[in-house]
């Protein structure tokens, strides 16, 4: 806490400029009017204040706006934003995408800090949902943003926002998240033709059910192995050898290299060895010829 002392004669700041870097902490406190600072906040970013001086400037704004800063100040915080705590940010009401962008720019190229996470949370909650423009902005700054949300939070993403999602934005998503995103993507891209649809939906297929994979196998999509390996195991298991062959097209040969990994390994165990042999890939581990396969789960469901 900086003591309240009178400003020395002739030192009262008329504007926020570089002369202030020569002020001691107490002089800044005494000689800089908080309202002046608020209106000329954008100038702070061009002045090499010390860390201690920044603390004084922040303290002045905190005193002027005890309930939280107005958006006109927030938008021009610049690197002073990095001095804010999550508690400070929780008091803010940020509604403008421009303000959000300005603050994200300050932290650009670095992992999401607690300050940024709190800011985004406040912004999204204020909007009520993750609209396309917001998602566009957030994934541009933080490609992993979408996958940092819980399935519950993802449920507020409208299907129209899915158009903003790039494949790399989904790299770190787990199956639970893709389960939520896939139906939204299916809805968003439903009016596209076959090949275009597949290009768009491909990144989301980790959440696709068996019936959708079966449908895709009828469309000559030539799914690559990397995509196939990300499919839900429970969705892949019921697929026949013929369906997998159609789904993968020329990429089917890649199954051999993945035969020890899920979901390929588990799928092989469910197929007749005869059927696997028709692929000519030397896949082993299928059900030997002459064995009867009872689907006990189906039997339980019927009873």
């Amino acid at each position: 806490e900086v003591e309240k002392t009178a400003c020395p004669s002739g030192k009262k700041a008329r504007e926020i400029d570089e002369s202030l870097i020569f002020y001691k902490k107490w002089e800044l406190e005494a000689c800089v009017d908080a309202a002046l600072l608020a209106t000329q906040m954008d100038r702070v970013n061009a002045i090499p204040f010390t860390y201690e001086q920044l603390d004084v400037l922040k303290h002045k704004l905190d005193e002027l706006y005890p309930q939280g800063y107005p958006e006109s100040v927030i938008q021009h915080l610049g690197y002073l934003f990095l001095k804010m705590s999550p508690e400070d940010i929780r008091k803010w009401n940020v509604t403008s995408l421009e303000t959000l962008k300005a603050l994200l720019e300050v932290n650009k190229g670095h992992e999401m800090s607690p300050q940024v996470a709190t800011l985004i949370d406040r912004f999204v909650k204020g909007r009520g949902q993750l609209d396309k423009d917001t998602l566009d902005t957030l994934t541009a700054f933080y490609p992993g943003y979408l996958c940092s949300l819980s399935p519950e939070e993802l449920s507020s993403v409208p299907p129209s926002s899915i158009w903003a999602v790039r494949p790399q934005d989904l790299d770190t998503c787990d199956p639970r998240q893709l389960d939520v995103l896939y139906p939204k993507a299916r809805l968003a891209f439903q009016n596209m033709n076959g090949s275009e649809y597949f290009v768009k939906i491909q990144s989301f297929l980790g959440g696709a059910p068996t019936e959708d994979l079966k449908a895709l196998s009828q469309q000559n999509v030539s799914m690559d192995l990397a995509t196939f390996m990300k499919l839900r195991t429970d969705a892949v298991l019921p697929l026949t050898v013929a369906e997998v062959q159609k789904l993968l097209g020329p990429h089917v040969e890649g199954l051999k290299a993945e035969e020890r990994h899920r979901p390929v390994r588990d799928w092989i165990l469910r197929q007749r060895q005869d059927d696997l042999d028709t692929l000519g890939l030397g896949l082993q581990g299928g059900i030997p010829n002459g064995y009867l396969v009872l689907d006990l789960s189906m039997q339980e469901a019927l009873s």
């Epitope: 061009a46 002045i47 090499p48 204040f49 010390t50 860390y51 201690e52 001086q53 920044l54 690197y79 990095l82 001095k83 705590s85 300050v106 932290n107 190229g109 670095h110 800090s113």
Partner: antibody
Framework: QVQLVESGGGVVQPGRSLRLSCAAS????????MNWVRQAPGKGLEWVAV????????YYADSVKGRFTISRDNSKNTLYLQMNSLRAEDTAVYYC????????????WGQGTLVTVSS | DIQMTQSPSTLSASVGDRVTITCRAS??????LAWYQQKPGKAPKLLIY???SLESGVPSRFSGSGSGTEFTLTISNLQPDDFATFYC?????????FGQGTKVEIK
């Protein structure tokens, strides 16, 4: 006068960890930011990391992100660099250096401590 | 990340010469640029900050200029003590990047 003294360097095997320290005196340590900069033998300077005066913000060069952690103890006037998963290319003299604000240069430097990563 | 490119990498000069080293940033850094001098086995020493401000105690024969992406360090009257390696460095709120260095050697 300002003094920065690094310690903790030595020979370490690839994959192992090491912690460097930098003891500061002659200035108000808790008021200033601190950096680590390294210099591989016969090479140029490479900035490694910065930590703000109160420890609230830490930033790293891409080459060490996820492996190195910068920290400070203001009560002990000491800066640290925890280096994990060390690689041969981390071999260098490591300097600590002070900055007075986010838009300040590195005005005081220690004499450095040598870290050699070799099997 | 902001890249800093220095030229030349080596410079041969004689005592009394005027020497100029240039530094180019991959994007605008305003005037947030420093110059350092380093002698073998020693820590770097700050010469110039904010592109043209002379650090206290540094001889006035050293000067800096430039803004945005193009910067220069000039030594107006090279002295025997000035033969060393010089580095430019950009600095901002969360990172610093050095140029690869310019070695000034005796011709």
């Amino acid at each position: 006068q300002v003094q920065l003294v690094e310690s903790g360097g030595g020979v370490v095997q690839p994959g192992r960890s090491l912690r460097l320290s930098c003891a500061a005196s002659g200035f108000t340590f808790s008021s200033d930011g601190m950096n680590w900069v390294r210099q591989a033998p016969g090479k140029g300077l490479e900035w490694v990391a910065v930590i703000w005066n109160d420890g609230s913000n830490k930033y790293y060069a891409d080459s060490v992100k996820g492996r190195f952690t910068i920290s400070r103890d203001n009560s002990k006037n000491t800066l640290y660099l925890q280096m994990n998963s060390l690689r041969a290319e981390d071999t260098a003299v490591y300097y600590c250096a002070r900055d007075r604000g986010p838009l300040w240069p590195l005005d005081y430097w220690g004499q450095g401590t040598l870290v050699t990563v070799s099997s | 990340d902001i890249q800093m490119t220095q030229s030349p990498s080596t410079l041969s000069a004689s005592v009394g010469d005027r020497v100029t080293i240039t530094c180019r940033a991959s994007q605008s850094i305003s005037r947030w640029l420093a110059w350092y001098q380093q002698k073998p086995g020693k820590a770097p020493k700050l010469l110039i900050y904010k592109a043209s401000s002379l650090e206290s105690g540094v001889p006035s024969r050293f000067s800096g200029s430039g803004s945005g992406t193009e910067f220069t360090l000039t030594i107006s009257n090279l002295q025997p003590d000035d033969f060393a390696t010089f580095y430019c460095q950009q600095y901002n709120a969360y990172s610093r990047t050095f140029g690869q260095g310019t070695k000034v050697e005796i011709k």
